[in-house]
Each structure stands twice: as structure tokens, then as C-alpha cells.
């Protein structure tokens, strides 16, 4: 059986697959997924290994019409480095010489300058090029190689291994060499895989059942450390509770060097955030941190300094801490907008069972603002999801030059932010460089400000506008309001009407349904339309909603289904990657972010059309 990294190299024109008959004969044969000799896999960014021989595809020289055969894998050899060129060409790195079928006289696969159909290769059974099943480095744990990546294949006691092995062990622990010759270099580490006993790599907090892995012997960059955690279905450490910090202080007390945690300010337009999307509500900075030096965007925990945090350049090589298991956040159910009939007094705006109101003109210090909201039967607003934030920005009349109190503060416990309405902190969205909590002036209260409505801590004594929120009162059956310019069941935002398509559909079916409604799959022109759509679909139970974006027409170039330029994107992490497909908006913790899906997957969708009676603005000229 093929493992997920293995593939057959298929030429569509001949309908045959590459077959490693012997190390010196790499030919083609009728495709057979059970034949070891036809299985290949990437073993580095640029090397392809024959699974049968544990040798790599290579050439004797970078010249036209030489045979491609198998060689001992050597990551330094220029003659074994392959890259995908446009679409389905596979070429030797840095040259216009391609992996070619050969011809009637030449049965062997050849290196050839021609880029026709005989030089075009796909993964058998798919429409994808060979790079779509690319190599993912596997970072090791423990061992003696400072967390270096596995080198496949590697030699141990004169035998070659293309996967992690328990050779030499009686306990089943899986390991790999981190250079191709363990026998000479003696460098190895344990694999970040599940095997009997691998749970002893983790420390479980008996109070919360959350597990932590301290990799103090590793030396990785922040991004590599994060990848290593993710390979174990974990994330770099987030700390949201004081108890959690205390537990980790104990766990790391015997260590001296810094360890990467998930805190970072890598997002271009927002502030400090945890990589696992936990709220940044507890602060434990080392005095003098975070320093404002550019590039110091990643954070380490300092065992030698009472486990306090320090921001460093992300390329520094350190140990790291992974975290997995139940999140330390209290479970807090946010009702879906559609579940709650929301009735609000005049001048209050409804959303998901609550009513909201901006007080912009009567500026008040935080304490007085809170008193006013409570007198009105509510509280300073708490914000629990990106959808709720985006509702406030897109539908409450929030303005880019606003600076408004919200309910978040650390008045009760310094450096531990809480909502004034007592609801748990499940979400934060800080402005770049925030929370700064400047020591020379107490910044215990929080404002929303700037075009995105992101947050900053502020001295509580400033007179500012504020946002109140209260529970809505349910009264009788809900009246469906027909919005002016939109048909019944459609929701208006600015010049457009939007509708959720409730039948699970492929991208093509969704597009057709919208067209039948004299509409189209939604485009997203800017941050504000994105905010509206996030609040529109983000709290729904379904995972995805189709938008009109895809690269169906030209692979790698994403276009809307209608003739409109792509001027704004909101990709999820690791997107769009190399995957061709159609774009859907996520809901839940990644609410509103865009993922590339296979176009024949079924999802709900959002249709859009011009509202009636709206004058179309002129098309922007470039």
C-alpha cells in the first residue's frame, strides 16, 4: 500500500509510470500501485528517492540527453536536485533540462531540453504535479542532534532506512539518523510520531490534563519549533492562566537557556498573539520586555529568570515548549446568530442574542462609561469571537478614527486581563505593539481603535467614547425584516444584498444556484466587506462557505467568477500553498479566513448582488 508521501510518476501521453528496474535502469511500465519499483517519494526539498532501492534519481552530468538513473542519496549533489517547473514539468535544478520519457530507441528515462508532452509528469491517479506531494522535514526529539531533521534515507549498521526505525532498540521507540550515515556521524534523534511509550515525552498537568513537552536540548528557530510541535498535533506553548505559568515555572526550574513559546507579533497589522489562537490576556514579561527593536517578533520563556518572557529575533536557535490536550480556556458557548431571536431597544443594534450601542459623543473615563452601560441594563462590551468584533466594525457605525472603551481590563489582577461583565476571555485582537502596559503610567483599561478596531491598553482616566452591550429580550415570534433594496431572506450591507445558500453544494453547483437567483458567488472587495461576511457566517455550525474565488481557469492565479479584480485577500495560514482549487471561508476559531478546497467538495455558500436602487460607483481606474 502507498503511504501518503509515496507516489507513482505518471506520463499522461503514454499512460505509463516510471519503473526503477534496477539502479542503472529507470524505465516505464504499465502503472501498478502495488509495485515497489514504481514507488517514489521526496526525501528533501529537491531529492526524489526510489522506495524499492532507497536510492535517489540523478544524472551523471547536467547535459542534454543523458540517462536518469539511481544514485546513493547525497543532499549536496547538484546532479540529484529536481524542481517542478511551470505546471507538470520536472527539471534538474537551475537548468532547462527536463525529466523525459525517452523514445523508441531509448527505453530509459532521459534528461532532455524538450518540454513537450513526453516531459510532462503527474502523480498517478491525480491531476497534481509531483511537487504537490512535497517533502516535509521531520524535526527530531531528544537524541544528540539538537533537534535536527531526519535525513532519509540513512545508514545504520550498514543497512539503509527510508523511515523512522526501532532498530537497535527493544522498546519500540522510533528514531532516525540526522545525517545520511549514522555509522560514521553517530547523530540521531527520536521521531515525533506515536509509538508505545511516546507519552513519556510529555508532562501532564494533573489539574488541567494539558500536556507539555520541554525540548531543552534542541536548537531550532521559532518557525521550526512551531513546525515540530505541529507534527505532534500540538502547538507552541500558550499561557493564559496564572496556574499554567506556575506549573511551567516548576517544570523548567532546572534549566537555564531560553525556550521558544507561541507568543509572537508576526501578523503585519496586529499585536502580540499566541500561535494557537488562545487569547493574549496574561502577561509575564521580563523587565525591559517587550523591547521595541524591529525584528524581535518571537518570544522565549527564560527558565533562569523565573520563567519570564523576552522577545527575540525569530531566527535565533533555542529549545522550545509544545502544548497539547484540553485547552486551558473555559468552554464558553457563543450562540449562533441564527439561533437567537434578537430584539433590541431603539438605537441598539442586534447580534447573536445581544444588543450593542456606541456612545461616541459623551466622552467618559472608563469607570463612568461602565456605570452608564450598567445603568442601561448592560455592561461595557465584551468581545468573544472575530465575528462579534467584525459585527461591531462593519454594522455598528464604527469609524476608523474612533477610540472607544471596551470591557477588558486588568484592574483586579495586574497583568491578567478580564471582561467587566464576568464572561471568560476567549479572544483578543491587539493593535501592533500592544498591549504595551507602559510601566511609567498604569494602562489597566482597553480601547478599540484604528481602522480595524483592534485593541490597545490605555490609562483608565482618559475621557473617551465607549461601547455598551446587553442581553437582548426575547419577545414573541421574530419578525423577518425585509431590508430596503433586497429581497426577503437577503441581508443588506452597503450597496449589496447577500444570501446564505443552505444546500450543501460543490463550487460549480453553488455558482449555478447564485446565477439562478440573478446573483453571483460573493466577491470580497475589502476589509470591511470581509468583516461583514465574517459576522454573517462565522458563528454558524457549518465549517465552510464558498466564495467566488478559484484558480480553475488558470492554475495558480486566483480569480472571481465575475470580472472583478482581486484587490483583497484573507488567507488562512499556509494558504493558498500549491494546491489548486476553490476558495471557501472558514467558520469557528478561524472565522472568515480563506481556505483552498477541492472544488467538488460540498459546502454552503454566499450569493451576492447589487441592491436595487443603488447607483453603481465608477470602476476604479489604474
Amino acid at each position: 500500500l502507498l503511504d501518503t508521501r509515496q507516489f507513482l510518476i505518471y506520463n499522461e501521453d503514454h499512460k505509463r509510470c516510471v519503473d526503477a528496474v534496477s539502479p542503472s535502469a529507470v524505465q516505464t511500465a504499465a502503472c501498478n500501485q502495488d509495485a515497489e519499483s514504481q514507488k517514489f517519494r521526496w526525501v528533501s526539498e529537491s531529492q526524489i528517492m526510489s522506495v524499492a532501492f532507497k536510492l535517489c534519481l540523478g544524472v551523471p552530468s547536467k547535459t542534454d540527453w543523458v540517462a536518469i538513473t539511481l544514485y546513493a542519496c547525497d543532499s549536496k549533489s547538484e546532479f540529484q536536485k529536481w524542481e517542478c517547473k511551470n505546471d507538470t514539468l520536472l527539471g534538474i535544478k537551475g537548468e532547462d533540462l527536463f525529466f523525459n520519457y525517452g523514445n523508441r530507441q531509448e527505453k530509459n528515462i532521459m534528461l532532455y531540453k524538450g518540454s513537450g508532452l513526453w516531459s510532462r509528469w503527474k502523480i498517478y491517479g491525480t491531476t497534481d504535479n509531483l511537487c504537490s506531494r512535497g517533502y516535509e522535514a521531520m524535526y527530531t526529539l531528544l537524541g544528540n542532534a539538537n533537534g535536527a531533521t531526519c535525513a532519509f534515507p540513512f545508514k545504520f549498521e550498514n543497512k539503509w532506512y527510508a523511515d523512522c526505525t526501532s532498530a537497535g532498540r527493544s522498546d519500540g521507540w522510533l528514531w532516525c539518523g540526522t545525517t545520511t550515515d549514522y555509522d560514521t556521524d553517530k547523530l540521531f534523534g527520536y521521531c515525533p510520531l506515536k509509538f508505545e511509550g511516546s507519552e513519556s515525552l510529555w508532562n501532564k498537568d494533573p489539574l488541567t490534563s494539558v500536556s507539555y513537552q520541554i525540548n531543552s536540548k534542541s536548537a531550532l528557530t521559532w518557525h521550526q519549533a512551531r513546525k515540530s510541535c505541529q507534527q505532534q498535533n500540538a502547538e507552541l506553548l500558550s499561557i493564559t492562566e496564572i496556574h499554567e505559568q506556575t506549573y511551567l515555572t516548576g517544570l523548567t526550574s532546572s534549566l537555564t537557556s531560553g525556550l521558544w513559546i507561541g507568543l509572537n507579533s508576526l501578523s503585519f497589522n496586529s499585536g502580540w498573539q499566541w500561535s494557537d489562537r488562545s487569547p493574549f490576556r496574561y502577561l509575564n514579561w521580563l523587565p525591559g520586555s517587550p523591547s521595541a527593536e524591529p525584528g524581535k517578533s518571537c518570544v522565549s520563556l527564560n527558565p533562569g529568570k523565573n520563567a519570564k518572557w523576552e522577545n527575540l529575533e525569530c531566527v535565533q536557535k533555542l529549545g522550545y515548549i509544545c502544548k497539547k490536550g484540553n485547552t486551558t480556556l473555559n468552554s464558553f458557548v457563543i450562540p449562533s446568530e441564527s439561533d437567537v431571536p434578537t430584539h433590541c431597544p431603539s438605537q441598539w443594534w442586534p447580534y447573536a442574542g445581544h444588543c450593542y450601542k456606541i456612545h461616541r459623543d459623551e466622552k467618559k473615563i472608563q469607570r463612568d462609561a461602565l456605570t452608564t452601560c450598567r445603568k442601561e441594563g448592560g455592561d461595557l462590551t465584551s468581545i468573544h469571537t472575530i465575528e462579534e468584533l467584525d459585527f461591531i466594525i462593519s454594522q455598528l457605525g464604527y469609524e476608523p478614527n474612533d477610540e472607544l472603551w471596551i470591557g477588558l481590563n486588568d484592574i483586579k489582577i495586574q497583568m491578567y486581563f478580564e471582561w467587566s461583565d464576568g464572561t471568560p476571555v476567549t479572544f483578543t485582537k491587539w493593535l501592533r505593539g500592544e498591549p504595551s502596559h507602559e510601566n511609567n503610567r498604569q494602562e489597566d483599561c482597553v480601547v478599540m481603535k484604528g481602522k480595524d478596531g483592534y485593541w490597545a491598553d490605555r490609562g483608565c482616566e482618559w475621557p473617551l467614547g465607549y461601547i455598551c452591550k446587553m442581553k437582548s429580550r426575547s419577545q414573541g415570534p421574530e419578525i423577518v425584516e425585509v431590508e430596503k433594496g433586497c429581497r426577503k431572506g437577503w441581508k443588506k450591507h452597503h450597496f449589496y444584498c447577500y444570501m446564505i445558500g443552505h444546500t450543501l453544494s460543490t463550487f460549480a453547483e453553488a455558482n449555478q444556484t447564485c446565477n439562478n437567483e440573478n446573483a453571483y458567488l460573493t466577491t470580497i472587495e475589502d476589509r470591511y466587506e470581509q468583516a461583514f461576511l465574517t459576522s454573517f457566517v462565522g458563528l454558524r455550525p457549518e465549517k465552510y462557505f464558498w466564495t467566488g474565488l478559484s484558480d480553475i481557469q488558470t492554475k495558480g492565479t486566483f480569480q472571481w467568477t465575475i470580472e472583478e479584480e482581486v484587490r483583497f485577500t484573507h488567507w488562512n495560514s499556509d494558504m493558498p500553498g500549491r494546491k489548486p482549487g476553490c476558495v471557501a471561508m472558514r467558520t469557528g476559531i478561524a472565522g472568515g479566513l480563506w481556505d483552498v478546497l477541492k472544488c467538488d467538495e460540498k459546502a454552503k455558500f454566499v450569493c451576492k448582488h447589487w441592491a436595487e436602487g443603488v447607483t453603481h460607483p465608477p470602476k476604479p481606474t489604474t
Epitope: 532498540r169 522498546d171 540521531f188 511509550g197
Partner: nanobody
Framework: QLVESGGSLRLSCAAS????????MGWYRQAPGKQREEVAA???????NYADSVKGRFTISRDNAKNTVYLQMNSLKPEDTAVYYC?????????????WGQGTLVTVSS
């Protein structure tokens, strides 16, 4: 070590060096002219296993904090005469897991 038949003896074995964790520890013995055989083993979780010939007479235990394993031998018989070896299955800075002690001779006289 010389002990009379019916007597008792306690063996101990400590693992040291750059050890991350010890997954199992055990005692083996080799009588003159015979194959080495497992006497008793204990996992990191404390599960134990005994050879039929010693069940009810020998007890294996371990002190995780000290990386030490013990073998309490009661009601000894002349056929228990052998060189006793301890083995630790460890996670350390080489990929090999099995580390052996140098062995101690136990002679049970009749």
C-alpha cells in the same frame, strides 16, 4: 555471593549517565553451560513479569528517582545458582536501548 539453600539475598542495580527515561529494567541469569534467561522485569509504570521458576519467591521493584532496580530473592535453591545480570532499557544519547550490568555471581549451596 554465597548463600545457603532456603536463604535470602537482595540484588540492586543503578543506571547512570545521560538518561532521559528508563522504559524498563529487568534481571537475567545465566547458569554454567546454559542460555541466558529472563528472571523478572518491571516497566516504568510498575508492571512486573516473572519467570515461572521464581514466581512467589522473587520480587522485583524499582526506585524511579534513583534509576535503580532491586531483586529480592527468598527461599533460594541450588538451581538458582547463576551469574545475575541487570538490564536497563533506556532513552539516552545513542539509539541503542539495552544496557547491561557486568553481572554478579550468586552461588546457593545445599
Amino acid at each position: 555471593q554465597l548463600v545457603e539453600s532456603g536463604g535470602s539475598l537482595r540484588l540492586s542495580c543503578a543506571a547512570s549517565g545521560s538518561i532521559f527515561t528508563i522504559n524498563a529494567m529487568g534481571w537475567y541469569r545465566q547458569a554454567p553451560g546454559k542460555q541466558r534467561e529472563e528472571v523478572a522485569a518491571i516497566t516504568s509504570g510498575g508492571s512486573t513479569n516473572y519467570a515461572d521458576s521464581v514466581k512467589g519467591r522473587f520480587t522485583i521493584s524499582r526506585d524511579n528517582a534513583k534509576n535503580t532496580v532491586y531483586l529480592q530473592m527468598n527461599s533460594l535453591k541450588p538451581e538458582d545458582t547463576a551469574v545475575y545480570y541487570c538490564k536497563a532499557v533506556v532513552v539516552t544519547t545513542t539509539p541503542y536501548s539495552d544496557y547491561w550490568g557486568q553481572g554478579t555471581l550468586v552461588t546457593v549451596s545445599s
